[in-house]
């Protein structure tokens, strides 16, 4: 089996949570600028399943403010530029990893969280429950 | 912008590039009490832009295996089931954070990145450009 | 490639512990979980718990909650998977397995464990 | 906790046979599906994720098939080697797995 070596260039942890606890670094690899999915497309407007992006923001979690998608109808447009109630909007949901602050204000603090966020929307045909 | 107040109850660091290096309780809390919502729908096969689902899989990163959607068609589906080639399926893409460990094999460090992945794919009317 | 190797046979009385080892060779545990899945004899499959070496992340069924404890030590790779109060019905082949979260790709070759008294 | 039901629990095919394993889950699960494929006394092998990618190594004779409750597995000729019990497993929620489908020689 392989034993991993003790790098001499690894932070050390005396936490007695370790390993549960570990230093993170925060200078985020691959930064891309463009944060505000609005500015990156304009597929929220000509979707036939269009959205609305609201802002989440919490002060207490890394990202801060993250975009959620709410679909701008139950229907969805069709070629005429009508809503039709024959095929339904519905959200695209992505688990995505953030960080809270635990115990909450701690500047250097945080516990890895999973949460559910509302990416855009997509338009389907409904499922028809047929009644016995 | 937000202050946040020093609270005496922190873990304290004194690590030179605070705040970028921060301690993170890797136990993590789902939010998302009912299990996996992520996974339950099959919005990719009932969608007018349906996709597919790719493994991107890297075993040196959290989580080791990402889901991509690759859209099936360059068009959407119409009422007929056919591929209708006047709109457009598209990804719909998101930023998520992934932890890589830094230095490799440290089994206490971490560094936070930023992926662009696609989520799913949704039906647009395309951009049509008019030649003067 | 990745290879999972498990400890050997043990025969154990009702009421009493095992614990079960799985090493990892031919690469580290990386960051994929490690779950654990029991057969009894003639019987299908049921996973039990698992766990991110990584974070040391645990996630129990409901089923075994209380009585199974899973760990691993990075430092030589392996995780293990403790069972208390044994009893008769514990009798199985106890698997541990890669697991990404959606799929186990690499099994350990299994450890039979017998309660008897 | 998901239920996987299989079926049939068992079924008789020949060398060359097509042979079609059902599986069904009492809740929606999306594509979140697999199949394992176990020979007596060895650990279960993966053949197919996520309802229809074929593992690397996995022979083409097998496929999979299906979305949100029923799925099915796919040998499109049956091989010597194929004859084990085969295992659906769902990965929505914490796992399960179904009861085992055991393909025997005719």
């Known amino acids: 089996g392989i034993t991993i070596p003790r790098n001499p260039g690894c932070p050390n942890s005396e936490d007695k949570n370790f390993p549960r606890t570990v230093m993170v670094n925060l200078n985020i690899h691959n930064r891309n600028t463009n944060t505000n999915p609005k500015r990156s497309s304009d597929y929220y407007n000509r979707s036939t399943s269009p959205w609305n992006l609201h802002r989440n923001e919490d002060p207490e979690r890394y990202p801060s403010v993250i975009w959620e998608a709410q679909c701008r109808h139950l229907g969805c447009i069709n070629a005429d530029g009508n809503v039709d109630y024959h095929m339904n909007s519905v959200p695209i949901q992505q688990e995505i990893l953030v960080l809270r602050r635990e115990p909450p204000h701690c500047p250097n603090s945080f516990r890895l969280e999973k949460i559910l966020v509302s990416v855009g929307c997509t338009c389907v045909t409904p499922i028809v429950h047929h009644v016995q | 912008g937000i202050t946040i107040p020093r609270n005496p109850g922190c873990p304290n660091s004194e690590d030179k590039n605070f705040p970028r290096t921060v301690m993170v309780n890797l136990n993590i809390h789902n939010r998302n009490t009912n299990t996996n919502p992520k996974r339950s729908s099959d919005y990719y096969n009932r969608s007018t832009s349906p996709w597919n689902l790719h493994r991107n899989e890297d075993p040196e990163r959290y989580p080791s295996v990402i889901w991509e959607a690759q859209c099936r068609h360059l068009g959407c589906i119409n009422a007929d089931g056919n591929v209708d080639y006047h709109m457009n399926s598209v990804p719909i893409q998101q930023e998520i954070l992934v932890l890589r460990r830094e230095p490799p094999h440290c089994p206490n460090s971490f560094r936070l990145e930023k992926i662009l992945v696609s989520v799913g794919c949704t039906c647009v009317t395309p951009i049509v450009h008019h030649v003067q | 490639q990745v290879q999972l190797v498990q400890s050997g046979a043990e025969v154990k009385k009702p009421g009493s512990s095992v614990k079960v080892s799985c090493k990892a060779s031919?690469?580290?545990?990386?960051?994929?979980?490690i779950s654990w899945v029991r057969q009894a004899p003639g019987q299908g499959l049921e996973w039990m718990g698992s766990?991110?070496?990584?974070?040391?992340?645990?996630n129990y069924a409901q089923k075994f909650q209380g009585r199974v404890t899973i760990t691993a030590d990075e430092s030589t790779s392996t995780a293990y998977m403790e069972l208390s109060s044994l009893r008769s019905e514990d009798t199985a082949v106890y698997y541990c397995?890669?697991?990404?979260?959606?799929?186990?790709?690499?099994w350990g070759q299994g450890t039979l464990v017998t309660v008897s008294s | 906790d998901i239920q996987m039901t299989q079926s049939p629990s068992s079924l008789s095919a020949s060398v060359g046979d097509r042979v079609t394993i059902t599986c069904r889950a009492s809740?929606?699960?999306?594509?979140?599906l697999n199949w394992y494929q176990q020979k007596p006394g060895k650990a279960p092998k993966l053949l197919i994720y996520?309802?229809?990618s074929l593992q690397s190594g996995v022979p083409s004779r097998f496929s999979g098939s299906g979305s949100g409750t029923d799925f099915t597995l796919t040998i499109s000729s049956l091989q010597p080697e194929d004859f084990a019990v085969y295992y659906c497993?769902?990965?929505?929620?914490?796992?399960?797995f179904g009861q085992g489908t055991k393909v025997e020689i005719k």
């Open positions: 397995a890669r697991d990404s979260e959606y799929y186990f790709d690499h």
């Open positions: 031919g690469g580290t545990f990386s960051s994929y979980a």
């Open positions: 766990i991110i070496p990584w974070f040391g992340y645990t």
């Open positions: 809740q929606g699960i999306s594509n979140w």
């Open positions: 996520a309802a229809s």
């Open positions: 497993q769902q990965y929505s929620d914490d796992p399960t």
